[in-house]
């Protein structure tokens, strides 16, 4: 990785399958300093799950969260 991860939390892997939409309460993007772009979905149990922003289901979930 060209960037140090010491200074900002980064995702180094993405969840393989979609989470149930109902389990997600919010999202945020990891820092631009991270080598891998990622969306972090926060579940209702407060787990932070890394997802690939290029995946269709991820974009759909983001749109849904923005609308709600």
């Amino acid at each position: 990785s060209p960037y140090s991860s010491d200074t900002t939390p980064c995702c180094f892997a993405y969840i393989a399958r979609p989470l149930p939409r109902a389990h997600i309460k919010e999202y945020f993007y990891t820092s631009g300093k991270c080598s891998n772009p990622a969306v972090v979905f926060v579940t209702r149990k407060n787990r932070q799950v890394c997802a690939n922003p290029e995946k269709k289901w991820v974009r759909e979930y983001i749109n849904s969260l923005e609308m709600s």
Epitope: D6, P9, C10, C11, A13, A16, V40, R47, Q48, C50
Partner: nanobody, 124 residues
């Protein structure tokens, strides 16, 4: 059965150092982050640092940077926390934990497995 066993805690004077160890067994942890948390009496458990088991990528809580160093030895299935320039406010029970690699691994809720903890006491 997954087991995380911490050791290396104890009583140390302010300004001193300790190295905590966490021996992991019971599964393959290559797809996990290993993290250290601490909990002082009457306070919530707080994140200290985490390391990717296979990647070695690290992340530290802001307040720990510079004094604490997390590392791992894959051959020994052990994760370490080197703590230098210890202060009385570092007194706490220190816990080792494991989080799936697809999480950000910076909050307690990201972690699936926990050790029993090791007490660190820093006297002034």
């Amino acid at each position: 059965e997954v087991q995380l066993v911490e050791s290396g805690g104890g009583l140390v004077q302010a300004g001193g150092s300790l190295r905590l160890s966490c021996a992991a067994s019971g599964r393959t942890f290559s797809s996990y982050y290993m993290g250290w948390f601490r909990q002082a009496p009457g306070k919530e458990r707080e994140f200290v640092a985490r390391i990717g088991w296979s990647s070695g990528s690290t992340y530290y809580a802001d307040s720990m940077k510079g004094r604490f160093t997390i590392s791992r030895d894959n051959a020994k299935n052990t994760v370490y926390l080197q703590m230098n320039s210890l202060k009385p406010e570092d007194t706490a029970v220190y816990y080792c934990a494991a989080a799936p690699r697809y999480t950000l691994a910076t909050v307690t809720y990201d972690y699936d497995y926990w050790g029993q903890g090791t007490q660190v006491t820093v006297s002034s």
